[in-house]
Amino acid sequence: DSEEDEEHTIITDTELPPLKLMHSFCAFKADDGPCKAIMKRFFFNIFTRQCEEFIYGGCEGNQNRFESLEECKKMCTRDNANRIIKTTLQQEKPDFCFLEEDPGICRGYITRYFYNNQTKQCERFKYGGCLGNMNNFETLEECKNICEDGPNGFQVDNYGTQLNAVNNSLTPQSTKVPSLFEFHGPSWCLTPADRGLCRANENRFYYNSVIGKCRPFKYSGCGGNENNFTSKQECLRACKKGFIQRISKGGLIKTKRKRKKQRVKIAYEEIFVKNM
């Protein structure tokens, strides 16, 4: 069905950097629990990358639940890391430098570096490719610059820019993507396409969770991650079913193809699930 893959067509072109979290529980879905109370709580939404309100039933649920917006932000957003890194004598390490290395929940293992607060050095570990926390750097140098002390006991570099909350880079903050979609499929569908380390050029498909489509990419033949499919159909089968389009204030988003819609009630909002 050639139109199948054109189902979700309207979304911003903004590509988000990989999401890194302070705590893995910030990635849990909002869970109202089995009880019937109506309690206003907050959770961190990994798709909007913001703390949002939800209705909690009063029992069970998970750790991604906070009494206040402030508490949620403190635990799950990096607003407090977006301060200017202090210069010279006033310099401090960002608090994420003290977090334990976290491989995350995916299994597309790649080399990353973390600051080991015990040895006071940046060290190598294997990152699974998604989630985890911000004590996670693509290069040893980046890790050293941000977390290690220089010879006189302060940071190696003096940065006059803000620390990017999402990808640890010292750049202006990225633009936010409207919260149009939710994803409830396998976690690796959220990982970026990864060519891997070899030299082949194999035609593969990966699920682009930003636009909700399977897209072609060139695979090197080794390494990479699990967001890697030999056909578009296989990619859609694995990842598309978890892709849910949310109602926005402007009503239901138009799609290229009309389909029967089945209404589902979930906690605090209504969503439409396409019959696949």
Epitope: E100, E101, D102, P103, Y109, I110, T111, N116, Q118, T119, Q121, E123, R124, F125, K126, T139, L140, L197, C198, G221, C222, G223
Partner: antibody
Framework: EVQLVESGGGLVKPGGSLRLSCAAS????????MSWVRQAPGKGLEWVST????????YYADSVQGRFTISRDNAKNSLYLQMNSLRAEDTAVYYC???????????WGQGTLVTVSS | DVVMTQTPLSLPVTLGQPASISCKSS???????????LNWLQQRPGQSPKRLIY???KLDSGVPDRFTGSGSGTDFTLKISRVEAEDVGVYYC?????????FGQGTKVEIK
Amino acid sequence: EVQLVESGGGLVKPGGSLRLSCAASGFTFSSYAMSWVRQAPGKGLEWVSTITTGGSYTYYADSVQGRFTISRDNAKNSLYLQMNSLRAEDTAVYYCARQDGQFLMDYWGQGTLVTVSS
Amino acid sequence: DVVMTQTPLSLPVTLGQPASISCKSSQSLLDIDGKTYLNWLQQRPGQSPKRLIYLVSKLDSGVPDRFTGSGSGTDFTLKISRVEAEDVGVYYCWQGTHFPFTFGQGTKVEIK
């Protein structure tokens, strides 16, 4: 001197459980990720599991995922491997190993033998 | 998973003579950080493994300089310039570039 001493091995029936321990000394245990590697009789080495410095996160080989649980107690300088639903193919000498700052195994214990047989 | 293949599996050598062990990986061991995490272990009879060489050619402390490691990409070699009696045992190459870590089958070095 870095020392790793494994214990807890023995004979167990298929489907049974066993808990291995590794006592570490001679280094700051909490500074290092730790691993278990096994060696079946007369065979080569197979990586089993790794745990991060603080013990919050773990890695497992597909062959043991869901059956084995690695854990650590930094206050006691100890590493553990809880092995459930044991199979004949789990029979091996189990070594604990320290991961250095390059995430490479640099020191190994003397091993403890686990035999799974009816 | 990355397959590590060692040759030969058995290596009878004369004391004082050189020895060479080859290790090939099914994919490149050059990591994205530019390092190659290829390592060699020595396991003497009845003992636990001991790390000899890491990152292709770096000798662990206390390892005699008659041991040298070389290679890149997928082809690696461990050389002993002059074999001594204490070198008897099984030598394993293993890779720490890709997860899971994988080991070669081992090469048994014995005196002729």
